[in-house]
Interface confidence: low
């Protein structure tokens, strides 16, 4: 190989061992019988050399540094050449470095031809191995602007006082052009300006200077985003740290076209703007840091650019001003994403503060809009608390558990609407009365409606789930001893059409000791399936539940249990079941941990089924499933 560097070229070539060097298989640069591991060639020198091994690329790297002095003479602006040409260099991993020194009053602009650049974070690498490392200068201190790959959005970087650009090319890469040019600009009065151009939908992740280390104290850095007017941009902060400020405040400032309040100032912990049409600027301003404990300011953020949806131009009013103790959350439904570029899906408050989830609270009127390619990606979860603190005031009081129409009119599917029903301990109990009788969801007879009510205890220490119930059954009411949550869960978009079928009234009633009482009025010719609460996990210890089953005068009820034995094994106490005729008070008692469950039995009058649990041994829980079927009395049942 021969490398000849012209005089006054201000180029230095350095060939040195890369890492890791494996010294047991030594490879040397050979110059007239001398074996050396490092070679430096300066302007005006011509050197002929070879390598002592077959694959020098596994051992050596080459650095070509060109110093460009704009202090003492004119700056050579324009397209930057790779000198010496890559074809004249040995095939080693090569780094071309351009070190440009200029006055503070001169702005320098690096312009990147297509493909533009994509910033990468610490620990990331570029797929093709080609990296651009860009640094600036503040007085004598070097500041890392960032490391970039090809195929991104960054088109220009403006700095002042000097710039150091390192282009790293792997030995096998055919690139023979620098891909950028340098232009002079007026002073930018800040650390740097990075221009990011979006041609269409896409995203860019960008970082503050020196990331992940601290942003220089009291500095200003700006990103200019060029976005087609028909697209919308949203900013989200992926990672940030705040330093300890002595004077001034760290902040981000947005210059948003059309905004009457430019610049809009945000704290880093604020929700950042979304749904911005067209170009905008974002600036990061540092502060004067505490000398004793400076901390670090750093920021990594993402800009997402996408088409606005029809919904994004509509404003929805959610009036919760008359509600109390209620919160509504719109959030992404959990799904596996497979598309390469997934447009963001945001909900915006007052059209500007957009985020992937939003919680609205009662007592106010809220204006929301959506910035989302597919609103089925979002759903709504609502929580409302109805509590009684004074038992004398609440007794016999009723509340309707209805989803407010304002919520039903939103273009987002309702997932859960939960009512937390709270009563004073040992003073009051609750009764739930549905507008339409309910069916309990079982494997044998699953619900196939668009919504169900999930009823569970709301006492933190108690793990008690009464079950899932849907309209169209035989359960007339459910009485529960103490605090519960009732969740209306939707299963299909058709809930909007079936919303009229929802309707549940809760009343506060005198306290009773049983955990739950189900009032069942079976319809003729249909089989009613009922099961004990906490199915699959077992009825909690020492819990008692009853079913009040009505039998019309002209009907006979057949009570059938679906297994021979209950399977429960008691550690302490007894588990038993009582079947009691309501008219005669005649009762049969079964020891569930010893006896065989009763064979199908026929009841001419209304009757009770009461099941009380012991303290079972783990793994031997009490789960019972039974059915009630009505048949006309005229049929001979023998």
């Amino acid at each position: 190989f021969e490398i000849a560097l012209p005089r006054e070229s201000n180029i230095t070539v350095l060939i040195k061992l890369g890492t890791p060097t494996l010294l047991a298989k030594p490879c040397y640069i050979v110059i007239s019988k001398r074996h050396i591991t490092m070679l430096s060639i300066k302007s005006g020198e011509r050197i002929v050399f070879t390598f002592s091994c077959q694959s020098p690329e596994n051992h050596f790297v080459i650095e070509i540094q060109k110093n460009i002095d704009c202090m003492s003479g004119p700056c050579p602006f324009g397209e930057v050449q790779l000198q010496p040409s890559t074809s004249l260099l040995p095939t080693l991993n090569r780094t071309f470095i351009w070190d440009v020194k200029a006055h503070k009053s001169i702005g320098l602009e690096l312009q990147f031809s297509i493909p533009r650049l994509r910033q990468i974070g610490p620990g990331e690498s570029c797929p093709d191995g080609v990296t651009h490392s860009i640094s600036g200068r503040i007085d004598a201190t070097v500041v890392r602007i960032g490391t970039f790959c090809s195929n991104g959005t960054v088109s220009r970087i403006k700095m002042q006082e000097g710039v150091k650009m390192a282009l790293h090319l792997p030995w096998f890469h055919p690139r023979n052009v620098s891909g950028f040019s340098i232009a002079n600009r007026s002073s930018i009065k800040r650390l740097c300006i990075i221009e990011s151009v979006f041609e269409g939908e896409g995203s860019a992740t960008l970082m503050s200077a020196n990331y992940p280390e601290g942003f220089p104290e009291d500095e200003l850095m700006t990103w200019q985003f060029v976005v087609p007017a028909h697209l919308r941009a949203s900013v989200s902060f992926l990672n940030f740290n705040l330093s300890n400020c002595e004077r001034k405040e760290e902040r981000v400032e947005y210059y948003i076209p059309g905004s009457t309040t430019n610049p809009e100032v945000f704290k880093l912990e604020d929700k950042q703007p979304g749904n911005m049409a067209g170009n905008f600027n974002l600036s990061l301003q540092g502060c004067d840091q505490d000398a004793q404990s400076p901390g670090i300011l750093r920021l990594q953020f993402q800009v997402l650019v996408q088409h606005p949806q029809n919904e994004s131009n509509k404003i929805y009013v959610v009036d919760l001003s008359n509600e109390r103790a209620m919160s509504l959350t719109i959030e992404p439904r959990p799904v596996k994403q497979s598309r390469k570029f997934v447009p963001g899906c945001f909900v915006c408050l007052e059209s500007r503060t957009c985020s992937s989830n939003l919680t609205l609270t009662s007592g106010s009127k809220h204006k929301i809009s959506f910035l989302c390619d597919d609103l089925t990606r979002l759903w709504m979860n609502v929580e409302k608390t109805i509590s009684c603190t004074d038992h004398r005031y609440c007794q016999r009081k009723s509340y309707s558990l209805q989803v407010p129409s304002d919520i039903l009119h939103l273009p987002v599917e309702l997932h859960d609407f939960s009512w937390k029903l709270l009563v004073p301990k040992d003073r009051l109990s609750l009764v739930l009365v549905p507008a339409q009788k309910l069916q309990q969801h079982t494997h044998e007879k699953p619900c196939n409606t668009s919504f169900s009510y999930l009823v569970a205890s709301a006492i933190p220490s108690q793990d008690l789930y009464f079950g899932s119930f849907c309209p169209g059954g035989s359960i007339k009411q459910i009485q529960v001893k103490q605090n519960i949550s009732v969740t209306l869960r939707t299963f299909a978009p058709s809930f909007q059409q079936e919303a009229s079928r929802q309707g549940l009234t809760v009343s506060f009633i005198p306290y009773f000791k049983e955990e739950g009482v189900f009032t069942v009025t079976p319809d003729t010719k249909s089989k009613v399936y009922l099961r004990t609460p906490n199915w699959d996990r077992g009825l909690p210890s020492l819990t008692s539940v009853s079913w009040n089953i009505s039998v019309p005068r002209d009907q006979v009820a057949c009570l059938t249990f679906f297994k021979e034995r209950s399977g429960v094994v008691c550690q302490t106490g007894r588990a038993f079941m009582i079947i009691q005729e309501q008219r005669t008070r005649a009762e049969e008692i079964f020891s569930l941990d010893e006896d065989v469950l009763p064979k199908p039995s026929f009841h001419h009058h209304s009757f009770w089924v009461n099941i009380s649990n012991c303290s079972p041994t783990s793994g031997k829980q009490l789960d019972l499933l039974f059915s009630v079927t009505l048949t006309p009395r005229t049929v001979d049942l023998t």
């Epitope: 890791p20 060097t21 494996l22 010294l23 047991a24 298989k25 030594p26 591991t37 694959s55 596994n58």
Partner: antibody, heavy 118, light 112 residues
Framework: QVQLQESGPGLVKPSETLSLTCTVS????????WSWIRQFSGKGLEWIGY???????NYNPSLKSRVTISVDTSKNQFSLKLSSVTAADSAVYYC????????????WGQGTLVTVSS | DIVMTQSPLSLPVTPGEPASISCRSS???????????LDWYLQKPGQSPQLLIY???DRASGVPDRFRGSGSGTDFTLKISRVEAEDVGIYYC?????????FGQGTKLEIK
């Protein structure tokens, strides 16, 4: 933490080919040299050869005619084949990673005993 | 091939006492880089060898500072300042200057 695991048959018949595989986990097989070393029952250690992820290799001249070391970067594995084995090739076979400076073997597998017998 | 010779072949030591193992190579292991291409390994009973010292005197990570490697050219020494019960096993030196790498025959350290 880098881990190496040898696998292969523990018994090989004389004149057949001994085949072992070393699976590297907890790190990439790229950018290091990977060696096979064996230890005879008398506790003596013998270096067999190394391979680089590009396929470049180097063998102990005493075994060169019988040994082949290959690499599969997609599986993070490298393999040893030793042909025409005799009882003298019975040993515990180790795979090891060669550290960047020195070189030295900074990570070793737990070893696999291979017996050559009919 | 470079021949490596260790002595002694067996070394009984009382816990808390120092120990010294010698390793001699048939030719100089001093590389043009200025490093000696000699490594020390310890093989504890039932285990794989583990690296103690590389480049003649550099301790591997996690190796206690009671282990010290010294020497240059053809004569090298591994010293243990205070032997502990966990130090028992066979100590090997290995040259890494030339292919093939070659090992010493091993020194068995045992507790008295």
């Amino acid at each position: 933490q880098v881990q190496l695991q040898e696998s292969g048959p523990g018994l090989v018949k004389p004149s057949e080919t001994l085949s072992l595989t070393c699976t590297v986990s907890g790190g990439s097989i790229s950018s290091y040299y990977w060696s096979w070393i064996r230890q005879f029952s008398g506790k003596g250690l013998e270096w067999i050869g190394y391979i680089y992820y590009t396929g470049r290799n180097n063998y102990n001249p005493s075994l060169k005619s019988r040994v082949t070391i290959s690499v599969d970067t997609s599986k993070n594995q490298f393999s040893l084949k030793l042909s025409s084995v005799t009882a003298a090739d019975s040993a515990v076979y180790y795979c090891a990673r060669e550290g960047g400076w020195g070189p030295h073997f900074d990570y070793w597998g737990q070893g696999t005993l291979v017996t050559v017998s009919s | 091939d470079i021949v490596m010779t260790q002595s002694p072949l067996s070394l009984p030591v009382t816990p808390g006492e120092p120990a010294s193992i010698s390793c001699r190579s048939s030719q100089s292991l001093l590389h043009s880089s200025g490093y000696n291409y000699l490594d020390w390994y310890l093989q504890k009973p039932g285990q794989s060898p583990q690296l103690l010292i590389y480049l003649g005197s550099d301790r591997a990570s996690g190796v206690p500072d009671r282990f010290r490697g010294s020497g240059s050219g053809t004569d090298f020494t591994l010293k243990i300042s205070r032997v502990e019960a966990e130090d028992v096993g066979i100590y090997y030196c290995m040259q890494a200057l030339q292919i093939p790498y070659t090992f010493g025959q091993g020194t068995k350290l045992e507790i008295k």
